[in-house]
């Protein structure tokens, strides 16, 4: 601005938001995870940042461990405090199994449709939060190319923390979770060294989904 | 909601065999490990075992191995404990419990969140 | 095996006073698993604490665990009524589920 108070020139903002993304979050509710709540936090942290609302940023939340449960659809609630609400109610399902792949696949083909609110033409993220190898991993190569193929942004989680409980190697899990991120991977994949962990990486993964929005 | 009934209350003779019971709903039994703890009159809380519905994978602590037997029918969301010959020193109330948690990959871990109401067991 | 010691046995108390029960591992406890449960005469024990300091679902913040490695306290800020009961703390690091002897608390 000039002494007159006349623009000599502007500056372009660094993104401008649509802030319309359409995000399904992939829950392993499997036994192993452990405590729960541990994720119920994770998720209240993750939610109260976003803007949800029919014109704005929708969320639906699958869980998966043995067989897979829609929690809630995409267009279920129009607010972040409903959300918050139905996210702080979601139990554990349990079970011995992690059928990663199928979580995956389901999410893409019945949470991401429009009949459970999906929106056309507005991007589609995905966001993967697991702790162990899946028992289906056979499948997850297909699995992983199908959401290639419908342009769905993926961030993977690694909880490591049944395997440090078991002084088990991580090697083999974190290489299957880093293959479910979407490319580049040191921006859409994370590891956390047990579920506690969880709530740390928040902030990073929010800000990483919402330049997607640019 | 969750609820863990547990079989009534039995009185038997020494040498004899027993079964109780544990009948989960309100939630996917097959799904969560079930635990036993005994407690002796007057006596605190012992860990006895635990069980997997699904697949009736077992793990026993060492106090309790060979002296017990525990056992699952998925199809009816039911957990057992079972002597073969029991003994006075059995005179209990057994509780069965939901682990909110897990057993397997070299570990177990997690707390017992529902509890069953209890059975006594006297044997004399 | 961890070996818990709970102190005192016995507390003597009225109600509205604070209670501190102690709950001592013979070696770490690893991740902070500890748990602390209240049984009342004829009843099933009631889980209160998981993972040394968060309360289970419908326990009043009255009630409040603390602690790491092997010490452990759990402390009721107000005593009611009907919290006048035996509680045992339990650890879940080791593969196996150990509890403490218990410590009974008594209206004074």
């Known amino acids: 601005v000039s002494p007159t108070f006349q623009v000599v020139n502007s500056i372009a903002p660094v993104q401008e938001c649509s802030t319309q993304l359409d995000i399904v979050i992939v829950l392993d509710g499997s036994n192993s995870i452990y405590p729960w709540d541990s994720v119920t936090a994770f998720l209240n942290d993750l939610l109260e940042r976003m803007d949800i609302g029919p014109k704005q940023t929708q969320v639906g939340i699958v869980q998966y461990g043995e067989n897979v449960t829609h929690e809630f659809n995409l267009n279920k609630y129009s607010s972040t405090e409903e959300v918050l609400v139905a996210a702080k109610k979601i139990v554990q399902r349990g079970g011995r199994q992690t059928m990663t792949a199928l979580g995956i696949d389901t999410a893409r083909k019945e949470a991401f449709t429009e009949a459970r609110g999906a929106r056309r033409g507005v991007k589609k993220v995905m966001v993967i939060v697991t702790d162990g190898e899946s028992h289906d991993n056979h499948r997850l190569k297909k699995v992983i190319q199908d959401c290639e193929d419908e342009n769905i942004q993926r961030f993977s989680i690694a909880i490591l923390g049944s395997y440090n409980r078991g002084n088990l190697s991580t090697e083999k899990f974190v290489e299957e979770i880093k293959s479910i991120a979407s490319e580049p991977t040191e921006k859409h994949f994370f590891n956390v060294s047990d579920e506690l962990a969880l709530v740390t990486i928040v902030k990073a993964l929010g800000e990483r989904i919402f330049a997607l929005e640019a | 909601e969750v609820q863990l009934v547990q079989s009534g209350a039995e009185v038997k003779k020494p040498g004899e065999s027993l079964r109780i019971s544990c009948k989960g709903s309100g939630y996917s039994v097959s799904s969560y490990w079930i635990g036993w703890v005994r407690q002796m009159p007057g006596k605190g809380l012992e860990w006895m075992g635990i069980?997997?519905?699904?697949?009736?994978?077992?793990r026993y602590s060492p106090s309790f191995q060979g002296q017990v037997t525990i056992s699952a029918d998925k199809s009816i969301s039911t957990a057992f404990l079972q002597w073969i010959s029991l003994k006075a020193s059995d005179t209990a109330m057994y509780y069965c419990a939901r682990l909110q948690g897990d057993c397997s990959g070299g570990s177990c871990y997690g707390h017992f969140d529902y509890w069953g109401q209890g059975t006594l067991v006297t044997v004399s | 095996e961890i070996v818990l010691t709970q102190s005192p046995g016995t507390l003597s108390l009225s109600p509205g006073e604070r209670a501190t029960l102690s709950c001592r591992a013979s070696q770490t406890i690893s991740s902070g698993y500890l748990a602390w449960y209240q049984q009342k005469p004829a009843q099933a024990p009631r889980l209160l604490i998981y993972v040394a300091s968060r309360r289970a679902t419908g326990i009043p913040d009255r009630f409040s665990g603390s602690g790491s490695g092997t010490d452990f306290t759990l402390t009721i800020s107000r005593l009611e009524p009907e919290d006048f009961a035996v509680y045992y703390c339990?650890?879940?690091?080791?593969?196996?589920?150990?509890f403490g002897q218990g410590t009974t608390v008594e209206i004074k």
């Open positions: 069980i997997y519905p699904g697949d009736s994978d077992t």
């Open positions: 339990q650890q879940y690091g080791s593969s196996s589920w150990t």
